[in-house]
């Protein structure tokens, strides 16, 4: 039994953790830096979206971008109870607090404002220089979304890296599973088309969520052959001339359900991840 | 002066290279069978490519993941010079040989092999498994093409690397590069598109003359309308129903210069590169 | 030169279901585009309702999409709506029309006005 | 949805006046514009689309402008077979209609 509560263990972990974040600002600064330049780089490159062909070859593709750069950045949160392992075993053997009340202190204090971050900034920038679909709900709709991803891709990192005592093997671990995700996120390849005993594996891809969310966002009720008189030649109906049409060609469910299920799904993977990191701190104290 | 010529020296550098590579064949043992397993898993994901909408996806898609899997895998080169650093250094102030000798040494009997197999191994598993198109000449074009890239890639992680004393630095530049470089291939956007000011990027990067040469080699002549007579005049815009038109709309050259210049460029990447790792090498026995 | 038929009952009942029917003369829907449907409610307010490609593929306005079905019969060279549960508000003037897309509509037919009451 | 909205909704002129029809998006739909006329008892027709382009075999007399939010249909010369309601039509995002301008004779 502890003599201070699980709320004051936890706001005393969060407010050391965000000390430490306040007092070495270089890493967080360069971060926001970083995303800041890669931001403006991205909405330079794909700036002012077409609606033709190549509109809809670009949106893909920034969209893919966006998803897999949030699945890779979050390697780095392999450190999160890598680097203060030492100081955790000690100070949870010396009875400071509870491993919930640390688990949850880091989370609160250091994953979710380093996450975050990104999302929004990435959103703001790259949104209006693209000219993405001028809605607000479809805006924050992708800023939510950058973050489902971040989160689930950072609570992967969580789950293979806590207890570990050296960070190159779970970034190892991580990168390889991102690589295969990536293949399966639905841009290099037409999941409609993979073998049935293979397509299973797209449902534990994290920037398949991510990416389908976005899509659905973005091209739901898209024209891609604006102006197209109805009496032209009989080959533009190979053309994909809506943003359902390209949808169903992706296997993407055009229903208000085919957007949120990929949210639920991520939230499913964010509390799964999360559980296996804090059991896995839990059975690390048992075995110190 | 030397007592022994280039060429003895050459041999003997190469010699000594190739009996510790196969003195400690795990690393090039464990490369195969990764890059079989990954050629497999390739393989089993995009097998039996369609002739339709869903078929230039992934034709598409996985021409850009070999290309960029090369690249990608070539970051390990920035160890060929690094971790040998000091002993040729030593060697080479007690006059055992030219720096060309050692240079051209590695080069031939570690960069050289080790770099073409998994061009070769890629080519031979995903070719036949996916169904690309059934010629001899396409087949080596495609593995020629894959060489290319591995070695226009490994070239630039030796300038980057070489004379350095710590492999990180070397890693992380090469890795946001190439991600850069990912970026301007042309799948994630349609390189028609990007502002001038901008567009010019494209010719400096490595996955772009790749993908370019295999889309080149691919989508030659192909039909993408079953059913369509691919020579009927299309009017439409729209519509992707041959190869050519594919082509054209991603600013392919259809021309055979189209496919070449890739290739001419790739060497004049390679030569430029491995210049630049020379003069490093040849700069850094100066200052030693 | 294409033409487009509409044809049903221009009378139904609350809560039953809606069907119409389209014929087409001078081009076989297989051959190309979208064969779409749209009403016009009185007081002018116009409504795209959904269409059916040539590939037999649907989409339909999401105001719409949970009772609203368009199905074909390539023999006949037909096409059908089938509006579920109708309120006195689905009362309206439908046109059936040729498109690609969201585009303009250059290929209409005569509409059929269909009243919803009890 | 994007709301179209037309003004007026109904316009009386004389033969031979120049007409100008409004219609305004309720957000950017660049030029994915398309003009309508429907005479009682008949089917829409389409007069313009892409906001300037005249559809074939409609008379010169007709010609639309405008970009983004603010487009306007013209008639140089008003016949009398142009009594008709005029629709515009958005294509931008999905479809949508205006609630059409009644157009008469004084």
């Known amino acids: 039994s502890y003599t201070t509560s699980f709320c004051h263990q936890l706001r005393w972990v969060s407010k050391r953790s965000f000390k430490n974040l306040l007092g070495n600002p270089q890493a967080s600064i360069a971060q926001i830096i970083v995303t800041v330049i890669l931001g403006l780089v991205i909405g330079a490159i794909y700036f002012g979206l077409n609606n033709d062909s190549t509109g809809i070859q670009n949106r893909a593709g920034v969209l893919f971008f966006l998803t897999t750069n949030q699945c890779f950045s979050s390697v780095s949160a392999v450190e999160l109870f890598v680097v203060e392992k030492k100081l955790f075993i000690h100070e949870y053997i010396s009875g400071y607090y509870r491993v919930s009340s640390y688990f949850f202190g880091k989370l609160l204090s250091d994953l979710l404002p380093m996450r975050m971050l990104p999302s929004i900034i990435f959103t703001c920038i790259v949104y209006f220089m693209l000219g993405l679909k001028p809605t607000a709900d479809a805006f924050f709709i992708m800023m939510f979304t950058l973050m489902m991803v971040a989160y689930s891709a950072s609570s992967m990192a969580l789950a293979i890296a806590a207890g570990q005592s050296v960070v190159s093997v779970a970034t190892l671990l991580m990168t390889i599973c991102f690589v295969f995700m990536m293949i399966f996120s639905g841009l290099l390849v037409n999941l409609t088309t993979i073998a049935s005993w293979l397509s299973w594996l797209q449902y534990f891809s994290i920037p398949r969520y991510g990416f389908t969310a976005l899509q659905h966002n973005e091209f739901l009720g898209q024209n891609f052959c604006p102006g197209l008189n109805a009496t032209v030649n009989n080959t533009c109906n190979y053309a994909t001339c809506t943003g359902e049409e390209y949808l169903t060609k992706q296997g993407i469910d055009l229903s208000p359900w085919g957007l949120w299920k990929n949210h639920v799904a991520l939230a499913c993977m964010i509390v799964i991840f999360l559980t296996i990191a804090y059991l896995k701190l839990l059975f690390l104290k048992k075995y110190s | 002066s030397y007592t022994t010529s280039f060429c003895h020296q050459l041999r003997w550098v190469s010699k000594r290279s190739f009996k510790n590579l196969l003195g400690n064949p795990q690393a090039s043992i464990a490369q195969i069978i990764v890059t079989v397993i990954l050629g497999l898993v390739i393989g089993a994901i995009y097998f039996g490519l369609n002739n339709d909408s869903t078929g230039i996806q992934n034709r598409a898609g996985v021409l850009f993941f070999l290309t960029t899997n090369q690249c990608f895998s070539s970051v390990s080169a920035v160890e060929l010079f690094v971790v040998e650093k000091k002993l040729f250094i030593h060697e080479y102030i007690s006059g055992y040989y030219r720096v060309s000798s050692y240079f051209f040494g590695k080069l031939l009997s570690d960069l050289l092999p080790m770099r073409m197999l998994p061009s070769i191994i890629f080519t031979c598993i995903v070719y036949f498994m996916l169904g690309l198109k059934p010629t001899a000449d396409a087949f080596f074009i495609m593995m020629f093409t894959l060489m290319m890239v591995a070695y226009s890639a490994s070239s630039m992680a030796l300038a980057i690397a070489a004379g350095q004393s710590v492999v990180s630095v070397a890693t992380l530049l090469m890795t946001i590069c190439f991600v850069f470089m990912m970026i301007f291939s042309g799948l994630l956007v349609n390189l028609t598109t990007i502002a001038s000011w901008l567009s010019w990027l494209q010719y400096f990067s490595i996955p772009r003359y790749g993908f370019t040469a295999l889309q080149h080699n691919e989508f030659l002549g192909q039909n993408f309308c079953p059913g369509l007579n691919a020579t009927v005049n299309n009017t439409c815009n729209y519509a992707t129903c041959t190869g050519e038109e594919y082509l054209t709309k991603q600013g392919i050259d259809l021309s055979p210069w189209g496919l070449w210049k890739n290739h001419v460029a790739l060497a004049c990447m390679i030569v430029i590169f491995l210049t630049i790792a020379y003069l490093k090498l040849l700069f850094l026995k100066k200052y030693s | 030169e294409v033409k487009l038929l509409e044809s049903g009952p221009g009378l139904v009942k609350p809560s039953q279901s809606l069907s119409l029917t389209c014929s087409v003369t001078?081009?076989?829907?297989?051959?190309?585009?979208?064969w779409s449907w749209i009403r016009k409610f009185p007081g002018n307010k116009m409504e795209w309702m959904g269409y059916?490609?040539?590939?037999?593929?649907?989409n339909y306005n999401p105001s719409l999409r949970s009772r609203i079905s368009i199905s074909r019969d390539t023999s006949k060279n037909q096409f059908f709506l089938q509006l579920n549960s109708v309120t006195t508000e689905d009362t309206a003037t439908y046109y059936c029309?040729?498109?690609?897309?969201?585009?303009?509509?250059?290929?209409w037919g005569q509409g059929t006005l269909v009243t919803v009451s009890s | 949805d994007i709301v179209m909205t037309q003004s007026p909704s109904l316009l009386s002129a004389s033969v031979g006046d120049r007409v100008t029809l409004s219609c305004k998006a309720g957000?950017?739909?660049?030029?994915?514009l398309a003009w309508y006329q429907q005479k009682l008892g008949e089917a829409p027709k389409l007069l313009i689309y892409?906001?300037?382009s005249l559809q074939t075999g409609i008379p010169s007399r007709f010609s639309g402008s405008g970009s983004g939010t603010d487009f306007t249909l013209t008639i140089s010369s008003l016949q009398p077979e142009d009594v008709a309601t005029y629709f515009c039509?958005?294509?931008?995002?999905?479809?949508?209609f205006g609630s059409g301008t009644k157009l008469e004779i004084k």
């Open positions: 957000q950017n739909i660049n030029n994915y």
């Open positions: 892409n906001a300037n």
């Open positions: 001078g081009y076989t829907i297989t051959s190309g585009y979208d």
């Open positions: 029309a040729r498109v690609r897309g969201y585009n303009p509509f250059a290929y």
């Open positions: 039509q958005q294509y931008n995002s999905w479809t949508t």
């Open positions: 059916i490609s040539y590939s037999g593929w649907t």
